[in-house]
């Protein structure tokens, strides 16, 4: 007796986060001998699409022509062979950008710091929102959540940096969201580029979770130091 | 129990379209994709497409794209399927058909079907 | 298109009789094979699903069998109310096919 099919892989076109009315294909990959591929999406009750695979059979196209809010979510795919149904594939989570207002993002005191320095990213929106995401361009690992501790919403959210190096460097844009759908987040903020001039001592960030040795400087988590922010936000890496 | 109360028999004009309508009862319709199946006088069946009441999402036969467009109204439970172009070719009988399960695309369920005819 | 080819296309037999109904696909359809029951002026009743699964209140008189491409509907004691047309459907793939039909007449 075989084991279990080896489950299939899935991913979004042209990313999984996509912006109200844009176009966005989920693609489902599993194996030569799929004979169908199901798209599911939690918390929806019926399989949310079902397709025949294309040719050479080893993968299906799932198609959005207009991204909107109940696009969003979290989904897996299976394909079916002639043995029986795979096993899930990893999830996906499909964000929509666009769902609210723009915030603001500013750097305090200024957004260019001298290396060694401190610099704190102010994320600003006009509704009370209870998550904020601070993303760097170019960063492997983009997302840094503040989330508020018992859904009090909040105006802003504070990113700290110290001691800022060369790493912190680069443009930043920043997302405001609400807890009940972290899938729909607001429109960007406009782009913030923070500029760090050189000092004597160049001090490189402690990261606080290992990362790959291959990874070059952008490809290091955003690490922000220092204490929880005082707005009752609690830091939730992603 | 499960039952799939279909709209009347139509009586169409060459050129125009008409809108079916398939109203759901006995069950969670969210639940179920619904099939579409057109059956011409005393002929064989043919299977249109279908829909996921849930979200609206559709497949549809390569020869029926042109053809058919379904949709659902999930507040009243009812399926609908709008045929344009009207031909002759187009007198059928059509059914609404309801999805067996998750993990099965039987179809278990058939509405009463409703009878198109296309005529000048 | 997978397509589905029944035989007979017609046949008469007489009631206690047991008949035979069978379907082959133009390929292997992994037993995703559907039977339906058609009266004049009615709409299909589902007999049996994934090739030999009975659907629940049928009677235990019809069973499905077969697997690959060849399929069959057997009637193990002909009774009146069986008359009608028996159609197979594939679903194996999209989209999916139906048989042309066999009817049942009574002998």
């Known amino acids: 007796q075989a084991g279990p099919l080896p489950k299939p892989t899935l991913w979004a076109e042209p990313g999984s986060v996509i912006s109200w009315g844009n176009s966005v294909t989920i693609w489902c990959q599993g194996t030569l001998e799929a004979r169908e591929y199901r798209l599911d999406k939690e918390e929806s009750p019926a399989p949310w699409d079902r397709q025949n695979p294309l040719e050479p059979k080893n993968k299906a196209r799932f198609s959005i022509p207009s991204m909107t809010e109940d696009y969003a979510g979290r989904y897996r795919c299976y394909y079916r062979s002639p043995v029986g149904w795979s096993q899930p594939s990893d999830p996906l989570e499909l964000v929509m950008t666009g769902a609210y207002s723009k915030p603001t993002l500013s750097a305090l005191p200024s957004p260019l710091v001298t290396s060694g320095k401190s610099v704190t990213l102010l994320c600003q929106s006009r509704s009370p929102m209870d998550t904020f995401l601070l993303i760097k361009e170019r960063a492997a690992h983009p997302l840094l959540h503040l989330r508020s501790e018992h859904g009090a919403q909040q105006h802003q959210a504070e990113f700290p940096m110290s001691p800022v190096t060369s790493v912190h460097g680069g443009t930043y844009r920043c997302f405001s969201s609400h807890g009940f759908s972290h899938y729909l987040l607001s429109h960007p903020s406009d782009p913030l580029e923070l500029i760090v001039s050189g000092s004597l001592e160049d001090p490189r960030p402690s990261p606080t979770r290992s990362v790959s040795t291959a990874a070059g400087p952008e490809d290091q988590p955003l690490m922000p130091t220092g204490s929880v922010p005082h707005s009752g936000l609690r830091r939730h890496w992603e | 129990q499960v039952q799939l109360e279909q709209s009347g028999a139509e009586l169409v004009k060459p050129g125009a379209s008409v809108k079916l309508s398939c109203k759901a009862s006995g069950y969670t319709f969210t639940n179920y994709w619904m099939h579409w199946v057109k059956q011409r006088h005393g002929q064989g069946l043919e299977w249109i497409g279908e829909i996921n009441p849930s979200n609206g999402r559709t497949n549809y036969n390569e020869k029926f794209k042109t053809k058919a467009t379904l949709t659902v109204d999930k507040s009243s439970s009812t399926a609908y399927m709008q045929l344009s172009s009207l031909t002759s070719e187009d007198s059928a009988v059509y059914y609404c058909a309801k999805n067996y399960r998750y993990d099965d695309w039987a179809m278990d369920y058939w509405g009463q079907g409703t009878s198109v005819t296309v005529s000048s | 298109d997978i397509v589905l080819t029944q035989s007979p296309s017609s046949m008469y037999a007489s009631l206690g009789e047991r008949v035979t109904i069978t379907c082959k696909a133009s390929?292997?359809?992994?037993?995703?094979l559907s039977w339906f029951q058609q009266k004049p002026g009615k709409s299909p009743k589902t007999l049996i699903y994934r090739a030999n699964r009975l659907v629940d209140g049928v009677p235990s008189r019809f069973s499905g069998s077969g697997s690959g491409q060849d399929y069959s509907l057997t009637i193990s004691s002909l009774e009146y109310e069986d008359m009608g047309i028996y159609y197979c459907l594939q679903y194996d793939e999209i989209p999916p096919t139906f048989g042309a039909g066999t009817k049942l007449e009574l002998k």
């Open positions: 390929e292997d359809i992994n037993s995703y």
